[in-house]
């Protein structure tokens, strides 16, 4: 191990230097260590499983964005191995506070049974 | 240029022993993780050997786990399967195939050497 | 092991049709599902790795789909050149394991 080395970088024995990780292509994340200094000899990348995607690099794949089940939101584009589900307008019986801050989430929509009286997607 | 080529088959009695190569050429055979697959006579493939590119990790499948070994020669370009306690059921081609590199699974095949077993 | 089935065995079609080869693991292998096509010299080539991937130099004419457990390879328009048997194999546990294969005749 060579603690000169960066957290994606490994010792190449034969030229002696640090030398960067092999990244992963989009849809897939590392498999076996490489870091450090070290780099495992069947360090590799694996496909993202389904219901996660990476942009690749050295991220792991993470699961994709639970627009109904989380948001309560249509959705809008379905994520693949590539890339997260993009979330649409609400479910039925739901509405989106406009004027509330994104939190870590972004939107989030809310059940019409709280919103203000008059609410343009509740009415009806 | 043929990139992977076997040699070694032949017949072979049960029992005896027999040690297969695969000559690797046009590309770099350290960088690579290397496998040894074989097809019994109207049979599907099977996966029997697996040797990293710098042999720190070895696997081999049940069927011939303890009887076979994979080894390789990283200087002389060259994949090795030495077969002892040969038996009828390892009547078949045998394929050398590379592990492409970080990924998990067979990219390139050699044309097969085939072993038969018998008295 | 992980069982890889390819219920058809051998299949029948024309030129120019689409054709659907299926596979299935006897649990998720999390795309780690591989395409392999070997001709009746004994040829053998990779065609789709994880899924949906095409292999380099190979025809957009294949394609794969599926995840879990259910996998499939579609040739969308049958060339003669297409009749070989094709395995599919699961990298996901070890031992790396492969369906029986299909084989693809011209009718």
């Known amino acids: 191990e060579d603690s000169n080395c960066g957290e994606n970088e490994y010792h190449n024995q034969t030229t002696g230097l640090c030398q960067q990780c092999p990244p992963c292509r989009p849809g897939e994340e590392p498999y076996m260590s490489c870091g450090y200094g070290t780099k495992d000899d069947d360090y590799g990348c694996v496909p993202c499983p389904a219901e996660k995607f990476s942009k690749g690099g050295y991220q792991i794949c993470r699961r994709h964005k639970d627009c109904e089940g989380f948001f309560r939101a249509t959705v809008l584009t379905p994520g693949d191995m590539e890339n997260d589900a993009e979330c649409g307008p609400c479910l039925p019986g739901y509405y989106m506070l406009e004027n509330r801050p994104r939190n870590i989430y972004g939107m989030v929509c809310y059940s019409c049974l709280l919103a203000p009286p008059n609410t343009k997607e509740c009415v009806g | 240029e043929v990139p992977l080529e076997e040699s070694g088959g032949g017949l072979v009695k049960p029992g005896g022993s027999r040690k297969l190569s695969c000559a690797a050429s046009g590309f770099t055979f350290s960088d690579h993780g290397m496998h040894w697959v074989r097809q019994a006579p109207e049979k599907g493939l099977e996966w029997i050997a697996y040797i990293s590119s710098g042999s720190s990790n070895v696997y081999y499948s049940d069927t011939v786990k303890g009887r076979f070994t994979i080894s390789r020669d990283n200087a002389k370009n060259t994949l090795f399967l030495q077969m002892t306690s040969l038996r009828s059921e390892d009547t078949a081609m045998y394929y050398c195939?590379?592990?492409?590199?970080?990924?998990?699974?067979?990219?390139?095949w050699g044309a097969g050497t085939t072993v038969t077993v018998s008295s | 092991d992980i069982q890889m089935t390819q219920t058809t065995s051998s299949l029948s079609a024309s030129l120019g049709d689409r054709v659907t080869i299926s596979c299935r693991a006897s649990?998720?292998?999390?795309?780690?599902l591989n395409w392999y096509q070997q001709k009746p010299d004994g040829t053998v080539k990779l065609l789709i790795y994880y899924t949906s991937r095409i292999h380099s130099g190979v025809p957009s004419r294949f394609s794969g789909s599926g995840s879990g457990t259910d996998y499939s390879l579609t040739i969308s328009n049958l060339e003669q050149e297409d009749i070989a048997t094709y395995f599919c194999?699961?990298?996901?546990?070890?031992?790396?394991?492969f369906g029986g294969g299909t084989k693809l005749e011209i009718k």
């Open positions: 649990q998720d292998i999390g795309n780690h």
């Open positions: 194999q699961q990298g996901n546990t070890l031992p790396w394991t």
């Open positions: 195939a590379r592990r492409e590199l970080l990924r998990f699974y067979f990219d390139v």
